[in-house]
């Protein structure tokens, strides 16, 4: 299950991965030295019945339909890290791999 | 980040894990031999700003606020498998570990 990839011109209404460049400078996040911007991507779209479900559990909850369950939503199902150079809270410069920064795949869960 | 655990008596409105027993017999899924029922759990609740976010990415998308992004939703952030005994599509009975069957933790992503 590779998920769908879309862009701003797509007519796809279902759960899809869209391109998004995060710009730390635009946020005013000056404690991040590098990168100043990176391709993060994001997830958006409808989760129709059985579409793009990452887990069997998602379908089972739809079947059981408990009180308060809102149905599956379009969310990252595969993410990857990026290496960043940044000031930590002690004002030390750190080079580290930060997990959960890039959406590689979207699905319904 | 251990997530919140709730039950049907909880007044918690934020993203929380709730108990749910899935009953395969009630679904009429007779190809599943064991278990006949199991504790699956599910996620429900509001995702307030910065609450229970699994990934830094979630906050970044909220900051960037691209067109069509619906904001984070309450979804499984940690899942575990169960071992199941079931008929496969060749009518063989298989014992296998099925991933993504139990919600261990909920969060906003």
């Amino acid at each position: 299950n590779l998920g769908l990839d879309c862009d701003e011109h797509s007519s796809e209404s279902r759960c899809c991965r869209y391109p998004l460049t995060v710009d730390f400078e635009a946020f005013g996040w000056d404690w991040i030295i590098a990168p100043k911007r990176y391709k993060a991507n994001y997830c958006s779209g409808q989760c129709e019945y059985m579409f793009m479900q990452k887990y069997p559990h998602t379908h089972l909850v739809q079947q059981a339909n408990p009180r308060g369950s809102a149905g599956p939503c379009c969310t990252p199902t595969k993410m990857s890290p990026i290496n960043m150079l940044y000031f930590n809270d002690k004002q030390q410069i750190i080079y580290g791999k930060i997990p959960g920064m890039v959406v590689d795949r979207c699905g319904c869960s | 980040n251990l997530g919140l655990d709730c039950d049907e008596h909880s007044s918690e409105s934020r993203c929380c894990r709730y108990p749910l027993t899935v009953d395969f017999e009630a679904f009429g899924w007779d190809w599943i031999i064991a278990p006949k029922r199991y504790k699956a759990n599910y996620c429900s609740g509001q995702c307030e700003y910065m609450f229970m976010q699994k990934y830094p990415h979630t906050h970044l998308v909220q900051q960037a606020n691209p067109r069509g992004s619906a904001g984070p939703c309450c979804t499984p952030t940690k899942m575990s498998p169960i071992n199941m005994l079931y008929f496969n599509d060749k009518q063989q009975i298989i014992y296998g570990k099925i991933p993504g069957m139990v919600v261990d933790r909920c969060g906003c992503s």
Epitope: - | I33, A34, P35, K36, Y38, K39, P81, N83, Q92, Y95
Partner: antibody, heavy 125, light 107 residues
């Protein structure tokens, strides 16, 4: 602690039907995590799984015996039974009943524990 | 059906010895294998499940290992009560099948 006690005749004539019963004590046969099975062991040979049932009536059998085997459950008596039709001398064996259970705390299926005491069945005229 | 081949079929050993019994499956069964001990006139008793997990109440001198097609049961220091017949069971795909047994005798 679940215990299984077997009953039934030790001698069956060829072409007749072998019938054995296994009575469960120390637990309910209707427990949703329990499954009930039969295994046999011909003299001087290894064990052979015959089949397994669930209290709701779902059964699954060894294909080699399927055409002759019926396993059924009587929840009111807390017992389950084996019927093997058209027996021959090759069906002479010690027959065991056993419980399987699904451990829903660890989500593991557990085979054949505990066992009944065994019933020696001889097929002879 | 999956065949399980045990070796040796019989084995003579002394109290205090370390012995290993092997079980080879005709196809990959992951770790879906158990080991049982049977004494004459008695029902089998489960020693090991999931290839290497020790059944509650079974002495720690019993251990299981292996996955895929090759499995073994090791008794680290034989005790008089360990002389019996040992069977392996595969429960990966039905019909569940047993090995033909290994008879462990006193030398």
């Amino acid at each position: 602690q679940v215990q299984l006690v077997q009953s039934g005749p030790g001698l069956v004539k060829p072409s007749e039907t072998l019938s054995l019963t296994c009575t469960v004590s120390g637990g309910s046969i209707s427990n949703s995590n329990y499954y009930w099975g039969w295994i046999r062991q011909p003299p001087g040979k290894g064990l052979e799984w015959i089949g397994t049932t669930y209290y709701s009536g779902t059964t699954y059998y060894n294909p080699s015996l399927k055409s002759r085997v019926t396993i059924s459950v009587d929840t009111s008596k807390n017992q389950f039974s084996l019927k093997l039709s058209s027996v021959t001398a090759a069906d002479t064996a010690v027959y065991y009943c056993a419980r399987d259970y699904y451990d829903s705390s660890g989500y593991y299926y557990n085979w054949f524990d505990p066992w009944g005491q065994g019933t020696t069945v001889t097929v002879s005229s | 059906d999956i065949q399980l081949t045990q070796s040796p079929s019989s084995l003579s050993a002394s109290v205090g010895d370390r012995v290993t019994i092997t079980c080879r499956a005709s196809q990959d069964i992951r770790n879906d294998l158990g080991w049982y001990q049977q004494k004459p006139g008695k029902a089998p008793k489960r020693l090991i499940y999931a290839a290497s997990s020790l059944q509650s109440g079974v002495p720690s001198r019993f251990s299981g290992s292996g996955s895929g097609t090759e499995f073994s049961l090791t008794l680290s220091s034989l005790q008089p009560e360990d002389f019996a017949t040992y069977f392996c069971l595969q429960h990966h795909i039905y019909p569940w099948t047993f090995g033909q047994g290994t008879k462990l005798e006193i030398k």
